[in-house]
């Protein structure tokens, strides 16, 4: 019997300083580019190696970005969201939603790979 997959959702404020090659991540989403079903939010699709976001370490692929410098990202066209990031300045504050997958196995069941002690 397979366990149920649940998600632990947390929010975090991440302050990034734009590096020599910018913020160092890509986004998907927007009202004209729904990447997640029934959700026009903005999501992180890629983090550039050695970029500002990667060096900070907190932003993860799959994170939903709720706001940039206090500006809500709801109901934005994709390109408008891109422009918002590109024009956000040197110090950029991101409000981010992390979604951590949690596997809940059936009670009393020990998986094959689990330690026995």
């Amino acid at each position: 019997m397979n366990g149920r997959v649940d998600y632990l959702v947390t929010e975090e404020e991440i302050n990034l300083t734009r590096g020599p090659s910018g913020l160092g991540f890509n986004i998907v989403g927007g009202t004209d580019q729904q990447y997640v079903s029934n959700d026009s939010g903005i999501y992180v699709s890629r983090i550039k190696e050695n970029g500002a976001a990667a060096l900070d370490g907190r932003l993860q692929e799959g994170d939903k970005i709720l706001s940039v410098n206090g500006q809500d990202l709801k109901n934005l066209l994709h390109q408008d969201a891109v422009d918002l990031f590109r024009n956000a300045g040197y110090a950029v504050s991101l409000r981010v939603q992390h979604r951590l997958q949690v596997q809940n196995g059936p009670i009393g069941h020990r998986g094959e790979g689990d330690p026995s002690g």
Partner: nanobody, 127 residues
């Protein structure tokens, strides 16, 4: 996973035109930023142009502005590079590239590290 196939290269005289095409596999083509790079013999691969997935924002390296135009047809999973007023220094192998999503940084910063998927390249020779 995206697979890219370029076509349209060839030999052309200075001042002439070519249109390169890049056909992409994959169901979510409109979510990808597409780019063109070129690589001359014994030189590094250099950014030429890019176009965003939805909304189609474009960016160009200074040396091709006003001469090259990047465009895309999301219904055909294809990106194009129209190259006009070609110069001998445009001679290179031209590579199509793709990356999921849109970079939050301006194309002034673009390098090959910003793209994950690459075609095999098509040779452009300007005599």
């Amino acid at each position: 996973q995206v697979q890219l196939v370029e076509s349209g290269g060839g030999l052309v005289q200075a001042g002439g035109s070519l249109r390169l095409s890049c056909s992409a596999s994959g169901r979510t083509f409109s979510s990808y930023t597409m780019g063109w790079f070129h690589q001359a013999p014994k030189k590094e691969r250099e950014f030429v142009a890019e176009i965003g997935g939805t909304g189609g924002g474009t960016g160009y390296t200074d040396s091709v502005k006003g001469r090259f135009t990047i465009s895309r047809d999301n219904a055909k999973n294809t990106v194009y590079l129209q190259m006009n007023s070609l110069k001998p220094e445009d001679t290179a192998v031209y590579y199509c590239a793709a990356v999921i999503g849109s970079p939050t940084d301006s194309s002034d910063y673009r390098s090959s590290l910003d793209f994950d998927y690459w075609g095999q390249g098509t040779q452009v020779t300007v005599s």
